[in-house]
């Protein structure tokens, strides 16, 4: 008799998930000398232990603590770049500006980037058919809880000037329901973080509007300044030129506004 399996609304675990995590771990620790001490098998065991045999709607931050401990990593606290709804450009930026870091430039973020995973209550199986959707099924699912946990820790570690890249093409440039808006903003430590600098990335080539005047940006400004952190906002009118100028700051065209 085939065993009944819960059907969730979201896509199932990424195929070859265990192999992918293990391979990414090995690659990361080879590239980053400061993480060479990490035992990738132990990392996978801790990752697996966070969700295997557990109901995928009852995952807690505590479930991920063994993994967090193994993945403990020190990044320069004043070189942190947060992002919201503009991951690709943020990653392109840190690939050029090598002294700045997104969450996905850390071991734990790198391991899980773009992956989905979940298990089933009381079985050691990974569910490759479906996993809970954050909206339609439940928020305390393995993927959402993981990102909430690592995002909180990443924000808590930040100091001095923290940068955030925001997508100026979205109807809500700052979205209170995004990971940045719901987790990271509220976990910046005023005792350590002096300023949050938002980079609003323009989409259209002819878009010369000052998106720092957007109501959602003013909402972010209000939240941040109430937390006793200064707020700075800059328009990035030409993201292509912006990246080019990060690569070649001496270029004569890079003195004008980008």
């Amino acid at each position: 008799v085939p065993r009944w399996r819960q059907q969730w609304s979201g896509p199932g675990t990424t195929k070859r998930f265990p192999e992918t995590v293990l391979a990414r771990c090995v690659k990361y620790t080879e590239i980053h000398p400061e993480m060479r001490h990490v035992d990738c098998q132990s990392v996978w065991d801790a990752f697996k232990g966070a969700f295997i045999s557990k109901h995928p709607c009852n995952i807690t931050e505590e479930d991920y603590q063994p993994l967090m401990k193994l993945g403990t990593q020190t990044v320069p606290c004043n070189k942190i770049l947060l992002w919201s709804r503009i991951k690709d450009l943020a990653h392109q930026f840190t690939q050029v500006q090598r002294d700045m870091f997104t969450l996905e430039d850390t071991l734990l973020g790198y391991l899980a980037d773009d992956l989905t995973w979940c298990g089933e209550f009381n079985t050691s199986k990974i569910n490759y058919q479906s996993c809970p959707d954050w909206r339609k099924d439940c928020s305390n699912n393995p993927v959402s809880v993981f990102w909430k946990t690592v995002s909180r820790r990443f924000a808590e570690a930040a100091c001095d000037v923290v940068h955030v890249m925001l997508n100026g093409s979205r109807s809500k440039i700052f979205d209170k329901n995004s990971t940045f808006g719901s987790v990271e903003v509220h976990n910046l430590q005023p005792e350590k973080v002096q300023t949050l600098e938002a980079w609003v990335i323009h989409g259209g080539r002819e878009d010369s509007r000052d998106l720092c005047q957007d109501p959602t940006i003013k909402e972010l400004e209000s939240i941040i300044s109430k937390r006793n952190i200064q707020f700075s906002c800059k328009n990035i009118y030409r993201p292509d030129k912006f990246l080019q100028c990060v690569k070649n700051p001496e270029d004569s065209s890079c003195t004008s506004e980008i």
Epitope: E191, K192, Q194, D210, Q230, S232, C233
Partner: antibody
Framework: QVQLQESGPGLVKPSETLSLTCTVS????????IHWIRQPPGKGLEWIGV???????DYNPSLKSRVTISKDNSKSQVSLKLSSVTAADTAVYYC?????????????WGQGTLVTVSS | EIVMTQSPPTLSLSPGERVTLSCRAS??????LVWYQQKPGQAPRLLIS???SLETSIPARFSGSGSGTDYTLTISSLQPEDFAVYYC?????????FGQGTKVEIK
């Protein structure tokens, strides 16, 4: 380039209201907060208050009951009103721009205007 | 409110000398400290923010240090144009408050 210029009467009678205007150029009042700071002759600096880019204000509690800061974005002007003045309010009054959008310290200052409270 | 205390009130020095100015807060201000320079008849000029960050166009002979409640402005080799009054300001909490100033005068 960024400039701030204070203007207003140099002499105010006791119990009257001191009114000053700060006219800015080189940036928009919708992008930065403007602070008022004063300095009695031969003394140190005292922060009076700020009007943020969105129009909200914060005041020094020691002056809060007497001070009002407002602005007109289209005219690039910020005004300071201080009521019921006494000789202790005699000072050079400065307006200054916050360093960042919501900045708590000041990178550009006006040249200051001396206001004397005397009958 | 946070009280900022600067010492000494006056320093009499010669060009070329090393200068150390002190600023103490009545409580922890978590590195939210700036230094200004003011010359007679002029508005203050921002030198350093966040304890150590030198403003653009400020000469490298100026430097800042400190943490918690105790902060220092150092001028490595005093130049004739450096004789002025120096103020510290905390921006940890409102009302933002200034020290009473240290006057650096020619000996």
């Amino acid at each position: 380039q960024v400039q701030l210029q204070e203007s207003g009467p140099g002499l105010v009678k006791p119990s009257e209201t001191l009114s000053l205007t700060c006219t800015v150029s080189g940036f928009s009042l919708t992008s930065y907060g403007i602070h008022w700071i004063r300095q009695p002759p031969g003394k140190g600096l005292e922060w009076i208050g700020v009007i943020w880019r969105g129009g909200s204000t914060d005041y020094n509690p020691s002056l809060k009951s007497r001070v009002t800061i407002s602005k007109d974005n289209s005219k690039s002007q910020v005004s300071l009103k201080l009521s019921s003045v006494t000789a202790a309010d005699t000072a050079v009054y400065y307006c200054a721009k916050g360093k960042v959008t919501t900045g708590f310290y000041f990178d550009f200052w006006g040249q200051g205007t001396l206001v004397t409270v005397s009958s | 409110e946070i009280v900022m205390t600067q010492s000494p009130p006056t320093l009499s020095l010669s060009p070329g000398e090393r200068v150390t100015l002190s600023c103490r807060a009545s409580e922890d201000i978590y590195n939210r400290l700036v230094w200004y320079q003011q010359k007679p008849g002029q508005a203050p000029r921002l030198l350093i923010s966040g304890v150590t960050s030198l403003e653009t166009s400020i000469p490298a002979r100026f430097s800042g240090s400190g943490s918690g409640t105790d902060y220092t402005l150092t001028i490595s080799s005093l130049q004739p144009e450096d004789f002025a009054v120096y103020y510290c300001q905390q921006y940890w909490s409102t009302p933002y408050t200034f020290g009473q100033g240290t006057k650096v005068e020619i000996k």
